[in-house]
């Protein structure tokens, strides 16, 4: 799709090309399975162009179909512990607020490995907050080439 000369003058945000790439900040306190994210040029190769962070969770500011992607590597991990824990270690990405739109978008399990990665296309609406829940007791790496989370606006 070619852009008109007028469109070429506009900032990407006004064209709807919202995009974010985040790195892990920290895990939650007891009973909180969420991962908390951070982004910005001062932190390295992470950024937010349109979406915003709300207490470490990613909030969408523009309706559209988005590519959501995530990779998580465990820093405390073993091939046995990922399969023998009473509660298997799983990663779920979902809309956690508003409550009326709450839904799981991605669910992955650490079966025999220490890294999981996935992506999918999904419609998101302004105000949707995405939460990433890591259940089980293993600890994710904060290395920026091992653990990252992002969204990319694809079309209205």
């Amino acid at each position: 799709q070619r852009l008109s000369r007028a469109q070429q003058q506009l900032p990407l945000e006004s064209l709807g090309w919202d995009i974010a790439e985040l790195q892990l900040n920290h895990t939650g306190p007891q009973q909180d399975p969420r991962l908390y994210w951070q982004g910005g040029p001062a932190l390295g190769r992470s950024f937010l162009r349109g979406p915003e962070l709300d207490k470490g969770q990613l909030r969408i500011r523009r309706d559209g179909i988005y590519m959501v992607h995530i990779q998580v590597t465990l820093a405390i991990c073993s091939s046995t512990s990922t399969s023998r824990h009473h509660h298997p270690t799983t990663l779920a990405v979902g809309i956690c607020s508003p409550a009326s739109r709450s839904i799981s978008l991605l669910r992955l399990s650490f079966h025999q490995g220490c890294t999981i990665a996935s992506q999918r296309l999904t419609p998101l609406a302004r105000g949707d907050t995405l939460c990433t829940n890591l259940t089980g007791t293993l600890l994710p790496s904060r290395n920026t080439d091992e653990t990252f989370f992002g969204v990319q606006w694809v079309r209205p």
Epitope: H26, T27, A75, I76, S78, S81, L139, P140, S141
Partner: antibody, heavy 120, light 108 residues
């Protein structure tokens, strides 16, 4: 300057309990995972337990699981190890250690250690 | 768990000589996540190398790490008097993290 100062070691009878503390300074304590590592006299180093920066995730060596409890108080910049049902083989110098920012359990700073002796 | 075997147990060398210490793992170490520590009598260990070959902050460049998979090496290019100590390797790619039992570098 990062400093880790252990306390609480001493002599205890088999079956007894002890609580170790580690006062941390010189870094943002709540941002880092921490571990306890021990070294029995003349023996190898052994990782004992780890805890995430927020305190929500804890990990134990098989040799201490169910007997030891790691915890932290981020408001006091202090790490703890509650040791119950102590055995002679728990006799060691216990080191408080700080993980690298990545969360991986390698240890860029160590305390001076506190000696725990389990003997009747 | 991964067992680390260090050799030799003791290395007798003179200041200025090159020291080569070996650490062998019972199975492959994930992403070469292996660290080396120096420990002097009555002191806590000090981190020298992480990620098999990256020097920790403040560590002189006479210390270097190499290797991958199951075989790792710590090299001290020219021994200084303060380098005589025990050296431990540690893998942290798999839980539990495990240590070798150390190589003692002593003055010949």
């Amino acid at each position: 300057e990062v400093q880790l100062l252990e306390s609480g070691g001493g002599m205890v009878q088999p079956g007894g309990s002890l609580r170790l503390s580690c006062a941390a300074s010189g870094f943002t304590f709540s941002s880092y995972a921490m571990s306890w590592v021990r070294q029995a006299p003349g023996k190898c180093l052994e990782w004992v337990s780890a805890i995430s920066g927020s305190g929500g995730r804890t990990f134990y060596a098989e040799s201490v699981e169910g007997r030891f409890t790691i915890s932290r108080d981020n408001s006091k910049n202090t790490l703890y190890l509650q040791m119950n049902s102590l055995r002679a083989e728990d006799t060691a110098v216990y080191y408080c250690t700080k993980h690298d920012y990545s969360n991986y359990p390698y240890f860029d700073y160590w305390g001076q250690g506190t000696l725990v002796t389990v003997s009747s | 768990e991964i067992v680390l075997t260090q050799s030799p147990g003791t290395l007798s060398l003179s200041p200025g000589e090159r020291a080569t210490l070996s650490c062998r793992a019972s199975q492959g170490v994930r992403s070469d996540y292996l660290a080396w520590y120096q420990q002097k009598p009555g002191q806590a260990p000090r981190l020298l190398i992480y990620g098999a070959s990256s020097r920790a902050t403040g560590i002189p460049d006479r210390f270097s790490g190499s290797g991958s998979g199951t075989d790792f090496t710590l090299t001290i290019s020219r021994l200084e008097p303060e380098d005589f100590a025990v050296y431990h390797c540690q893998q942290y790619g798999s839980t539990p993290p495990t240590f070798g039992c150390g190589t003692k570098v002593e003055i010949k």
